[in-house]
């Protein structure tokens, strides 16, 4: 696990105003899959094993933490930005 | 594997206060938000409110704001539920809960009576 | 703050049976959440994202719907499924539940 002021850095990185690092149950999505050989970039998570779990938000991909993250949109709250802001 | 481990159960008197406690292990906590959740005798299940353990950020139900203080202490990984001049209409069962994709982790439940 | 309707409240099937909940919102939302809560246990997430099957969950249970209207499907229903069934949202704040459907056996 990350230390506690790793995450906090991480998140201040992520957003000016941070929300919670979210990260999915493995289980839930099944294995992980396997990285890509070569030199090549990697594909961001984000675009397909990640795509749905941002609701009202964009998500990042934090490889430190090999998981990811919400930055939400105006109004929305929440771990997966998934709530209006009451 | 995540485990979120709850204080056990409190008899109280009405105009006192109680303190719950989340002691939460198996991830790491300043990673997701603490949510807590009422269920009265019988009844339904009711969001409390949710604090970001990284932040300290709060929300609060309206209707809880001024009945629960929601805190935590990460050096014990442990998220606080403090309720205050209580009445029979708070005797429930409290839980704490943490996010997957949705409330997929539960403590076992608090309950607190109150009682004179 | 959005208000969810359950029916029925109380429901008995025999074993075998094919069960279907509902969930109506006051308002639209993006998505629901269904639980299940045995007696004297905590609630256990079933269905996420309306029709995703959380962790360890049988296949029998199934969810589906849009907008104000989303149901939760036991394919067959077995001794086990004996709990209470409650549906949430959590599209605008405060996040909400249903006041819950209690299944019986037969």
């Known amino acids: 696990d990350l230390q506690e002021a790793d995450l906090d850095l991480l998140r201040v990185t992520l957003s000016s105003k941070p929300q919670a690092l979210a990260t999915p149950n493995k289980e839930e999505h099944g294995k992980r899959k396997k990285k890509g050989k070569g030199l090549g970039k990697k594909r961001d998570p984000c675009l397909r094993k990640y795509k749905d779990f941002c609701i009202h938000g964009e998500c990042k991909y934090v490889k430190e933490l090999r998981a990811p993250s919400c930055i939400c949109h105006p109004g929305y709250h929440g771990e997966r930005c998934h709530g209006l802001s009451l | 594997q995540v485990q979120l481990v709850q204080s056990g159960a409190e008899v109280v008197k009405p105009g006192s206060s109680v303190k719950v406690s989340c002691k939460a292990s198996g991830y790491s906590f300043s990673g997701y938000y603490m949510h807590w959740v009422k269920q009265a005798p019988g009844q339904g299940l009711e969001w409390i409110g949710e604090?970001?353990?990284?932040?300290?950020?709060?929300t609060y139900n309206q209707k809880f704001k001024a009945k629960a203080t929601l805190t935590v202490d990460r050096s014990t990984s442990t998220a606080y539920m403090e309720l205050k001049s209580l009445t029979s209409e708070d005797t429930a069962v409290y839980y704490c809960?943490?996010?997957?994709?949705?409330?997929?982790?539960w403590g076992q439940g608090t309950t607190v009576t109150v009682s004179s | 703050q959005i208000v969810l309707t359950q029916s029925p409240t109380t429901m008995a099937a025999s074993p075998g049976e094919k069960i279907t909940i509902t969930c109506s919102a006051s308002?639209?939302?993006?998505?629901m959440y269904w639980y299940q809560q045995r007696p004297g246990f905590s609630p256990k997430l079933l269905i996420y994202d309306t029709s995703n099957l959380a962790s360890g969950v049988p296949v029998r249970f199934s969810g589906s719907g849009s907008g104000t209207s989303y149901s939760l499907t036991i394919g067959t229903m077995e001794a086990e499924d004996v709990a209470t069934y409650y549906c949430q949202q959590w599209s605008s704040y405060p996040p909400t539940f249903g006041g819950g459907t209690k299944l019986e056996i037969k």
């Open positions: 809960t943490r996010i997957t994709w949705a409330f997929a982790y």
């Open positions: 308002s639209s939302v993006t998505y």
């Open positions: 604090i970001n353990p990284s932040t300290g950020g709060i």
